[in-house]
Interface confidence: low
Amino acid sequence: DAHKSEVAHRFKDLGEENFKALVLIAFAQYLQQCPFEDHVKLVNEVTEFAKTCVADESAENCDKSLHTLFGDKLCTVATLRETYGEMADCCAKQEPERNECFLQHKDDNPNLPRLVRPEVDVMCTAFHDNEETFLKKYLYEIARRHPYFYAPELLFFAKRYKAAFTECCQAADKAACLLPKLDELRDEGKASSAKQRLKCASLQKFGERAFKAWAVARLSQRFPKAEFAEVSKLVTDLTKVHTECCHGDLLECADDRADLAKYICENQDSISSKLKECCEKPLLEKSHCIAEVENDEMPADLPSLAADFVESKDVCKNYAEAKDVFLGMFLYEYARRHPDYSVVLLLRLAKTYETTLEKCCAAADPHECYAKVFDEFKPLVEEPQNLIKQNCELFEQLGEYKFQNALLVRYTKKVPQVSTPTLVEVSRNLGKVGSKCCKHPEAKRMPCAEDYLSVVLNQLCVLHEKTPVSDRVTKCCTESLVNRRPCFSALEVDETYVPKEFNAETFTFHADICTLSEKERQIKKQTALVELVKHKPKATKEQLKAVMDDFAAFVEKCCKADDKETCFAEEGKKLVAASQAALGL
């Protein structure tokens, strides 16, 4: 449905508040270094222009595309070349190349200062003094640090952020009320950002077909009572929403997401019995709730899959007629029967089935050729099951911190060229799979663990893509989306790696470590552990454990000392010498 003015259409659909918030998110995700005030000024100019178009859709420039309008606005920034370097060259291009150029310059790891949380009273004063600016600043700070954050979901986070301040700034104990809520929002926000980053990587690096396959599998698990046609419709609409958001078309994305939520709620009887509660909520909560809704119960008495996909004489005929539809039906039928499998496992099974049909439907006796295809699934299913069992046992034995350390050592030995901060961040997140998933019963462990690992390994892939240093990482990241985790799992110690020169400065610590939070202190220790492994990749677990135990004791001792700095200097030298001796450095 063509509109004379796209900007007027979106302004009317979304309302002024959401329009302004989404434009701010879009601009902050593109120009990540620009000051807040500059972005607010640009957003206000765009909003005023949109209002003129609402008043008269035939007014000058109102017929221009959103990319043209937004791109023109971004290209008015005076300091574009000084701040962004070659990104300024995007402005010499025409649409759609200009937008593609901006997208390519999005930085997953922007050089921005860490967000430091002010005192609660300071935050509450700022919130009360100017609520609108306070909330805009939240959107801006999150969007510029997470350039692929799912924009309509960020509006939901902002709503909860506002609710937390509204409630807690009136509470008797503001900090006790507010800080847990902010911690929760921060952790959930990071998780949401990482999940969305995988969706965008899937679309951008592997294409729409890969994303649609993922969506078929996930929605079929979630809505097993829905018919294939219904799931297909939802997949098509969901793909459009995420393609738009990943492409920077945030107004269209938010609008289409709202339409999709409306459709799901109007048709919940043919989709899922679990949607009732979600559908009673306001829009932002409703969309979030639908995205997180639990799997519906599987229909009783589902027939065997073999009848239609192995035993039938029409398998090759059906496959030849409409390959992707037939494979989609296979994936739908398999996924709705297996909420206990990870999505990536279901996609590996579908790929195996596709490869078998490609080969067998060209054979002399196709049926004889593909008759045992389901037998090929067994090892594919057992591999993640065994891996999760072993790692959950290790997690239960070690606890989260030491489990993270085991993964740090494992991954540093696999890909020692990767930067230490990236190895620490990724291994810490990989280690969180234990507390996140091992508590679940077996039927929920694999979807929890393997799909979470896909999200974390994608973080490694996007960070590594910015500055590639390891052919092994590149290979695992680019060959197959669904086999990334098995690819990394299969990597052994990199025998070609030349150990890093020993640098005592890396292992010099100061009294400031004593004032750090437990988490920050862990990161310091884990950073040292990675550096140790990079210096001595052949060190045994026992050697590393001994050094790390000594290190922990050293920190504890010096943090209790009267003259902390002297203790760190003197004891630190002894520790370095002892560690070198222990590791044979």
Partner: nanobody, 126 residues
Amino acid sequence: EVQLLESGGGLVQPGGSLRLSCAASGRYIDETAVAWFRQAPGKGREFVAGIGGGVDITYYADSVKGRFTISRDNSKNTLYLQMNSLRPEDTAVYYCAARPGRPLITSKQAELYPYWGQGTLVTVSS
């Protein structure tokens, strides 16, 4: 479908303590926002305390803050309400309620909870 079964109610003197339990079946309790409500004779249902789905964010009514503690044991699939410094005005039937779908925020509105236990009576009297 979630089934909830409360226990632990009884007669207690003012200043005393009680611990209520709510055993859930049919759903993992850590994936559900759960809450305790109470209904005093001749009054409506009143929110007492709640805990979010999938997260341990707790909420309390002003009248019980500092005296009552809500918690859950995921391994036992059970919700608890530890009640200390009990007062006569705490006398009521206490109900456990659940909202599936991992809502992080526990609502204080009774009508948003589709699943309820049958209640356990707490009487505070000397």
